[in-house]
Amino acid sequence: LQDLCSNCPAGTFCDNNRSQICSPCPPNSFSSAGGQRTCDICRQCKGVFKTRKECSSTSNAECDCISGYHCLGAECSMCEQDCKQGQELTKKGCKDCCFGTFNDQKRGICRPWTNCSLDGKSVLVNGTKERDVVCGPSPADLSPGASSATPPAPAREPGHSPQ
């Protein structure tokens, strides 16, 4: 049996109360695909949400988070409070990263500093709450007499300028 409603276009619904003719979606509702028997209610961006894209007859509204919050979940289903760099959000609010950990973003958790010694390297720049450590060459590379990766430049003869 063919669906009599399958050809009602997006932005409309197949109106059973009017002998299955296509009717436009009422205000504050939408249908993003054709052949719908009802229109969906538009999402409202309220409270910590702000409107990124208005609802139309064929597409739902899209929300963002207000300043000081960031989106979580599919289609920004939740807003989470921002923290400063060097902090993470806990149940009690924003807390500084513990020693040995860092967070370089306004969201997410504090992560441990890189352990340079695991790669046989040394710490070039110490870590902070906001930044990871920077690993440098291994201590062996820095010891006297270690062979250099670049050969020494050839000596020039006196009185000769370079080509």
Epitope: N7, P9, S19, Q20, I21, C22
Partner: nanobody, 121 residues
Framework: EVQLLESGGGEVQPGGSLRLSCAAS????????MGWYRQAPGKGREFVAA???????VYAESVKGRFTISRDNAKNTVYLQMSSLRAEDTAVYYC???????????????WGQGTLVTVKP
Amino acid sequence: EVQLLESGGGEVQPGGSLRLSCAASGFSFSINAMGWYRQAPGKGREFVAAIESGRNTVYAESVKGRFTISRDNAKNTVYLQMSSLRAEDTAVYYCGLLKGNRVVSPSVAYWGQGTLVTVKP
């Protein structure tokens, strides 16, 4: 309330032409398919032509190449241009609002009251 009002019928000689109009109101015309049907004396109602909101058209074999269906969404009106008319085209012509914007296997949700077309020498 849905209203469909046909006009343009009359008497014409074989080989002649007529243009039927159907003025629609009470619904969103531009998103719905419209059709023309006819009923000859002593016979059942039969499909003639239909046009979708997107302007796809379908015709009965008996009128293909002779009749043209069109629509003007700004005027909420559907037309049936009939040419090379034959005696067997004599019938009451009805405008129909089709269910679900369908022109394939169409089903009529609302009918007009009809306009008579008579083809005779």
